[in-house]
Interface confidence: medium
């Protein structure tokens, strides 16, 4: 019994996949795929706006944290990276690039420094930082 | 132009994937897929032998580091985890579970403790540890 059939269009061969195994994606080439989300960690330091532009140019957005369960790989991420969370001064809320509000209990927000952008750090922490500060960043693409 | 055709056997629909995008795997369900290798990080602490047995029971092996380029996701891994590297006292070499010798310049080996097993740590470091010490571990499955 097989859960899926993958048609290799190049050789027109069927590759059989056991029920317990599956393909992940699709994702941009050489991105990380996990629970059908695509992630990429970028080494070069950019400010938040440049990081956002870089992700957008790759048909992605900055990291959005929406589920500790579906994104449990993030708890093992080392260092600090820009994510897509921004502060809306008018109502004081934190929201994602797509306009959705940060769900309670998803991130521990550490608001010690002045800023309207947030760095993701391991164990689901968000450090508030000046948006102009250069940092590495994480892009994410949700698969359909 | 599309790089692959994925046949969804459940609904029998063809999903078209742009040239720049691709599927990754196949991997065990909910494992991380990167450059067609499958990885899983296990939270429970086990000694090296138990960790090896756990990976084997999932048709995988403990992490093997074979390429900084193909496995660059490992540089951002937080904490320390058993990998499949063991010390061979007879000839003093370090080898992987599959019997291959550790390639030079792949890992910085740090002998913090007396032992014959190695923990993987971020930035391609290997920490020598007593094989009986419980630690979290990384399983890996190479896709065909």
């Amino acid at each position: 019994i097989w859960s899926a059939v993958f048609l290799n269009s190049l050789f027109n061969q069927e590759v059989q996949i056991p029920l317990t195994e599956s393909y992940c994606g699709p994702c941009p080439k050489n991105w990380i795929c996990y629970k059908n989300n695509c992630y990429q960690f970028f080494d070069e330091s950019k400010n938040w706006y440049e990081s956002q532009a870089s992700c957008m140019s790759q048909n992605a957005s900055l990291l959005k944290v929406y589920s500790k369960e579906d994104q449990d790989l993030l708890k093992l991420v080392k260092s600090y990276h820009w994510m897509g969370l921004v502060h809306i001064p008018t109502n004081g809320s934190w929201q994602w690039e797509d306009g959705s509000i940060l769900s309670p209990n998803l991130l521990t927000i550490i608001e010690m420094q002045k800023g309207d952008c947030a760095l993701y750090a391991s164990s689901f922490k968000g450090y508030i930082e000046n948006c102009s500060t250069p940092n590495t960043y994480i892009c994410m693409q949700r698969t359909v | 132009i599309w790089s692959a055709v994925f046949l969804n056997s459940l609904f029998n629909q063809e999903v078209q994937i742009p040239l720049t995008e691709s599927y990754c795997g196949p991997c065990p369900k909910n494992w991380i897929c990167y450059k067609n290798n499958c990885y899983q990080f296990f939270d429970e602490s086990k000694n090296w032998y138990e960790s090896q047995a756990s990976c084997m029971s999932q048709n995988a092996s403990l992490l093997k580091v074979y390429s900084k380029e193909d496995q660059d996701l490992l540089k951002l891994v937080k904490s320390y985890h058993w990998m499949g590297l063991v010390h061979i006292p007879t000839n003093g070499s370090w080898q992987w579970e599959d019997g291959s010798i550790l390639s030079p310049n792949l890992l910085t080996i740090i002998e913090m403790q007396k032992g014959d097993c190695a923990l993987y740590a971020s930035s391609f470091k290997g920490y020598i540890e007593n094989c009986s010490t419980p630690n979290t571990y990384i399983c890996m499955q190479r896709t065909v």
Epitope: S79, E111, K114 | A121
Partner: antibody
Framework: QVQLVESGGGVVQPGRSLRLSCAAS????????MHWVRQAPGKGLEWVAV????????YYADSVKGRFTISRDNSKNTLYLQMNSLRAEDTAVYYC???????????WGQGTLVTVSS | QSVLTQPPSVSEAPRQRVTISCSGS????????VNWYQQLPGKAPKLLIY???LLPSGVSDRFSGSKSGTSASLAISGLQSEDEADYYC???????????FGGGTKLTVL
């Protein structure tokens, strides 16, 4: 370059009060959280208190809670530590330190000595 | 009694390697970044290692940090006489809502 200069230390009797200041220069003071850390003579470092960039968040060590108050005046680029009900065990060199998200205490002052003695 | 536990003193000969341990709990080292500070006699502390194992610019690569579970270590290789100092580990503690230091380790270069 970043500079932190503490002042206000001295000898004070038990039960009395003292206010320490830390003058900051060489960086945008109003953007950074700041800490006070102390060190009793011949002893180790002990964290005392932290204040967020705008003064809205403050945390204290249990040993000083209710007696010490951390504050800041961003218009003067100055950090303060108001110490009330002083005890002999508060005798220490008090350091102010800048907090950075990624490096925690990346810059320290040279310290000011507070001696609580009758 | 410090929340983080370090050996009071260590000593080693020049050019040798020494390791200083730091033991904590899940609420500090286990869940937060560990930093190491060097304090030379009569001086203010200086940041030596941040985020477990990263070196600030200007710090010699003879210093290295590591962390496993609720313990951390500082290693100094190629010991020099100018390394004689007190070394402190530190981390934020989620339970105490405060920053905690180890008791400090005095390094003597023989």
């Amino acid at each position: 370059q970043v500079q932190l200069v503490e002042s206000g230390g001295g000898v004070v009797q038990p039960g009395r009060s003292l206010r320490l200041s830390c003058a900051a220069s060489g960086f945008t003071f109003s953007s950074y959280a700041m800490h006070w850390v102390r060190q009793a003579p011949g002893k180790g470092l002990e964290w005392v208190a932290v204040i967020s960039y705008d003064g809205s968040n403050k945390y204290y060590a249990d040993s000083v809670k209710g007696r010490f108050t951390i504050s800041r005046d961003n218009s003067k680029n100055t950090l303060y530590l108001q110490m009330n009900s002083l005890r002999a065990e508060d005798t220490a060199v008090y350091y102010c330190a800048r907090y950075d998200n990624t490096r925690i205490f990346d810059y320290w002052g040279q310290g000011t000595l507070v001696t609580v003695s009758s | 009694q410090s929340v983080l536990t370090q050996p009071p003193s260590v000593s080693e000969a020049p050019r040798q390697r020494v390791t200083i341990s730091c033991s904590g709990s899940s609420s500090n080292i286990g869940n937060n970044a560990v930093n190491w500070y060097q304090q030379l006699p009569g001086k203010a502390p200086k940041l030596l290692i941040y985020y477990d194992d990263l070196l600030p610019s200007g710090v010699s690569d003879r210093f290295s940090g590591s962390k496993s579970g609720t313990s951390a270590s500082l290693a100094i290789s190629g010991l020099q006489s100018e390394d004689e100092a007190d070394y402190y580990c530190a981390a934020w503690d989620d339970s105490l809502n405060g920053y905690v230091f180890g008791g400090g380790t005095k390094l003597t270069v023989l």
